[in-house]
Amino acid sequence: KIDACKRGDVTVKPSHVILLGSTVNITCSLKPRQGCFHYSRRNKLILYKFDRRINFHHGHSLNSQVTGLPLGTTLFVCKLACINSDEIQICGAEIFVGVAPEQPQNLSCIQKGEQGTVACTWERGRDTHLYTEYTLQLSGPKNLTWQKQCKDIYCDYLDFGINLTPESPESNFTAKVTAVNSLGSSSSLPSTFTFLDIVRPLPPWDIRIKFQKASVSRCTLYWRDEGLVLLNRLRYRPSNSRLWNMVNVTKAKGRHDLLDLKPFTEYEFQISSKLHLYKGSWSDWSESLRAQTPEEEPTGMLDVWYMKRHIDYSRQQISLFWKNLSVSEARGKILHYQVTLQELTGGKAMTQNITGHTSWTTVIPRTGNWAVAVSAANSKGSSLPTRINIMNLCEAGLLAPRQVSANSEGMDNILVTWQPPRKDPSAVQEYVVEWRELHPGGDTQVPLNWLRSRPYNVSALISENIKSYICYEIRVYALSGDQGGCSSILGNSKHKAPLSGPHINAITEEKGSILISWNSIPVQEQMGCLLHYRIYWKERDSNSQPQLCEIPYRVSQNSHPINSLQPRVTYVLWMTALTAAGESSHGNEREFCLQGKAN
């Protein structure tokens, strides 16, 4: 704390608040009888700038010229030093350095709406660090003037509170802003404008949309605007899109027909307004209107596939599968699928509506020629039916694709490749690649996936519904007219050694050999496609290496004979399973002693 100048005075010229770059004169003078005891020439006056000595003088007063002070506050303290005593504070001074206002730039004025008030903004320029008074002046026709002041360090906006009217839209108005602080003043360049230049219309309101006869092709957008609006621009987009469609309209009078909307799509609409073709500015965009366009009947055709399963000598099961139409093809909410099954020679037909599923299973006689047609229906109509003749898809051996392989291709993808069939490859009209999770029971409830490939392709990347560590049964069909040939293979996108080995559930003796039966490894423990089983055996209590028999994996197989065991010797047996990544741990161990004679 600095004492309140009891021993002397500090005077400052020209002021305690100075312009950046200017000089300040600081004088420190002792009051009478306030110097050092005995001799005044022993008085040593010292001037400090913060804690640093910058000047001293022997006598009753000290005069110092200071330059180069930074923006903001600098503290000076005058002290008296006498021989054999501590320095005594005399008085202090704070000098504040600021900046004269720069010329305000980019003065622009706006009136929001025909009933709004004129408000102006500008760029202040460099911070003055000082209280700066801004005066905004507006002069108009008939020597009318308005003035508004704002007394704030950071002022860059003022509202006159007056409303310009359209009586004489071409009349000129001039605005100017002047900044004044204790270090100087500066005025902007004048900004001259007319009513039409500065009135920015209010955004349109009360936006509505109407579809005549519930049709997307007869759509009108309605809105309300201020009275003088001449131009509008409309923008609209599907709610899930980032790109806007833009339309400019003149003298729209609050309505416009839109011709290119897609059916059954939620759109966002916004409108902006302007008073004059080339003067003034566009209003803000209106609040968004969100509306869904009406449905139209579906376009496109369903992608249909099927599976045949033999039941007995007279009956077969047909399972039909189809893919959903894309949103742009469905053009509405699909209410049901219509499936028609027809025997082509007898003409008998049955039709069924399916809701909530994209598959249908039925049982038909094995005799006769059968065809199906499947279409999708929404509230406005149905898609064109997809017709398929039911045939034996794998009957034509010469049409079977050759050298089918399935290889992992990155995460959760399988690349299926093949060679064209031996029979004239040009006869192939298309390939269908089908895949489903491999289930030992051949479960028909397992979802079926397929994709179609052009006749010149010899590979397909399958990625839909592919999971890691699951084995898929993959078939490639070559279709030609009413014939088909197929080849199959197992494949997985990612594999590792199975988590467990098969569980031996029985060992039986048959004519000097044994039959081992086992339970399949649970699908979730197989960890990919099984390639082999191994059966191990060795004499009980023996340290010798076990013998083994390797069996290629077949889906339906769960027993195998072994005929190399010695009679009346107790053996320990166990099994493992192998994928391309390695061998599982042991399954359970079983002991067995063959009773019969050795072979």
Partner: nanobody
Framework: QVQLQESGGGLVQAGGSLVLSCAAS????????MSWYRQAPGKQRELVAE???????TYADSVEGRFTISRDNAKNIVDLQMNSLKPEDTAAYYC?????????????WGRGTQVTVSS
């Protein structure tokens, strides 16, 4: 912001004395500088004298030796002792307070008090 109230103005004979007083109220903390300005009819407003919170002073050349500015920091009062008054000292006298506002100065002004020196 600070509110300033001036008092002490009036009519005085040339050569006479007056004391103007200015009291600061409101958020009067951290008042860096208290000043007296004057504005004669048809002229620019000019600095008369100022006093910092540490007691240092500045005087206009025209009043040096005749006027004395003093400040009571505790009460936020600034006085201007005016001696040997001249007719050219006739003006409206305004009190001003500069307060710290972040790293800037914010100014507040009083409404003014009239001093008239007759010859």
């Amino acid at each position: 912001q600070v509110q300033l109230q001036e008092s002490g103005g009036g009519l005085v004979q040339a050569g006479g004395s007056l004391v103007l007083s200015c009291a600061a109220s409101g958020s009067a903390a951290l008042i860096f500088l208290m000043s007296w300005y004057r504005q004669a009819p048809g002229k620019q407003r000019e600095l008369v004298a100022e006093v910092s919170r540490y007691g240092s002073t500045t005087y206009a050349d025209s009043v040096e030796g005749r006027f004395t500015i003093s400040r009571d920091n505790a009460k936020n009062i600034v006085d201007l002792q005016m001696n040997s008054l001249k007719p050219e000292d006739t003006a409206a006298y305004y009190c001003k307070a500069d307060q710290y506002y972040g790293d800037s100065l914010r100014s507040s002004w009083g409404r003014g008090t009239q001093v008239t020196v007759s010859s």
